[in-house]
């Protein structure tokens, strides 16, 4: 009686059981009542990650540069190659199919989180008693200058681009 | 050789559930995205949603309450589900390579018309 | 919710003409935005990816640029097969991954 359902590791053609290909390998030719299944490695920068009876192995993963993207692991034939994220650059997406920049925190802005590989730079606006001056993806906002700690006072106040402006005393007051 | 293909229905009634499936071949599920892009006629690209390698799915704001896309690496196919169809849903939808990320490899489309 | 404003609509010009598609973000993607070709009955064609690259085999008379919000693409001299509706579309995360309204190169 032909089988209905097959082992694990095989597969049902021509109401026999046939062997898949292990992982790295494609299939060639089913089996027969005569042969075993025929198989193939896969050639160079192919790879195939299953048990399979694909008649054609997949081309591995290209790491676009345009997209940011460069090789964090190499493909075997039983892998695929693993792409990461140039340095600077963040994943558009947890599967990461792609990058940008990372993200620069205008002036009045502060870096409140560093980016990472996987997330953008996050950024803040300056309190009052803070200023940052530059575009930058890795500057906090800084605090104002204590002028009284330097015996001197504030000429020109602070904003939270600028810092405080210090000036001497005045020492001509009654 | 690396390819992506649509098929459902070409014509759905307004009310009913719309599925569509995208078979692809030449590329695993788990090492590239697919993502789902409709234009009505005569009008512009409108990016429905995706899922990535990872299996995680995306969604435009504006559909996600009518949108499930999911897949099954085996069969090679991802399928989009849309609720409450209504003739201004009338478009060709395409199915393309790539979750969030660029589309240089497209499908066909297959037009699907909303019609009672 | 985030948009992407492509113009003008639509365009006509010569063959040989410069042509200037522009697509303003309504917040920075840095240079997460990818332009488009499309002919009647065709899926879009990429050209280019990362603002400013252009994709396998696409004629360098195409060009892009931009930064933030604010993308432009160029055809240096139009052809007859360049005829066709361009579209942008950004991809910096999944709430900003959105297609231009088109533009279309028609025939003087």
């Known amino acids: 009686e032909p089988p209905t359902a097959c082992r694990e590791k095989q597969y049902l053609i021509n109401s026999q059981c046939c062997s898949l290909c292990q992982p790295g390998q494609k299939l060639v030719s089913d089996c027969t009542e005569f042969t075993e299944t025929e198989c193939l490695p896969c050639g160079e920068s192919e790879f195939l990650d299953t048990w399979n009876r694909e008649t054609h192995c997949h081309q591995h993963k290209y790491c676009d540069p345009n997209l940011g993207l460069r090789v964090q692991q190499k493909g075997t034939s039983e892998t695929d190659t693993i792409c990461t994220c140039e340095e600077g650059w963040h994943c558009t997406s947890e599967a990461c199919e792609s990058c940008v920049l990372h993200r620069s925190c205008s002036p009045g802005f502060g870096v409140k989180q560093i980016a990472t590989g996987v997330s953008d730079t996050i950024c803040e606006p300056c309190p009052v008693g803070f200023f940052s001056n530059v575009s930058s993806a890795f500057e906090k906002c800084h605090p104002w200058t204590s002028c009284e700690t330097k015996d001197l006072v504030v000429q020109q106040a602070g904003t939270n681009k600028t810092d405080v402006v210090c000036g001497p005393q005045d020492r001509l007051r009654a | 050789e690396v390819t992506v293909k649509e098929s459902g229905p070409v014509l759905v009634k307004p009310t009913e559930t719309l599925t569509l499936t995208c078979t692809v071949s030449?590329?695993?599920?788990?090492?590239?995205?697919v993502s789902w892009i409709r234009q009505p006629p005569g009008k512009a690209l409108e990016w429905l949603g995706g899922?990535?390698?990872?299996?995680?799915?995306y969604y435009a704001s504006w559909a996600k309450s009518r949108l499930t896309i999911s897949r099954d690496t085996n069969l090679k196919q991802v399928v989009l589900t849309m609720t409450n169809m209504d003739p201004v849903d009338t478009a060709t939808y395409y199915c393309?390579?790539?979750?969030?990320?660029?589309?240089?490899?497209w499908g066909q489309g297959t037009l699907v018309t909303v019609s009672s | 919710a985030f948009q992407l404003t492509q113009s003008p609509s639509s365009l006509s010009a010569s063959v040989g003409d410069r042509v200037t598609i522009t697509c303003q973000a309504s917040?920075?993607?840095?240079?997460?935005l990818a332009w488009y070709q499309q002919k009647p009955g065709k899926p879009p064609k990429l050209l280019i990816v990362?603002?400013?690259n252009l994709a396998s085999g696409v004629p360098s008379r195409f060009s892009g640029s931009g930064s933030g919000t604010d993308f432009t693409l160029t055809i240096s001299s139009l052809q007859p097969e360049d005829f066709a509706t361009y579209y942008c579309?950004?991809?910096?995360?999944?709430?900003?991954?959105?297609f231009g309204g088109g533009t279309k190169v028609e025939i003087k």
């Open positions: 393309a390579r790539g979750g969030i990320t660029v589309y240089a490899m």
């Open positions: 030449g590329f695993s599920l788990s090492s590239y995205g």
């Open positions: 899922i990535g390698s990872d299996g995680s799915a």
């Open positions: 917040q920075s993607i840095s240079q997460g």
């Open positions: 990362g603002a400013s």
């Open positions: 579309q950004s991809y910096f995360s999944s709430s900003s991954t959105v």
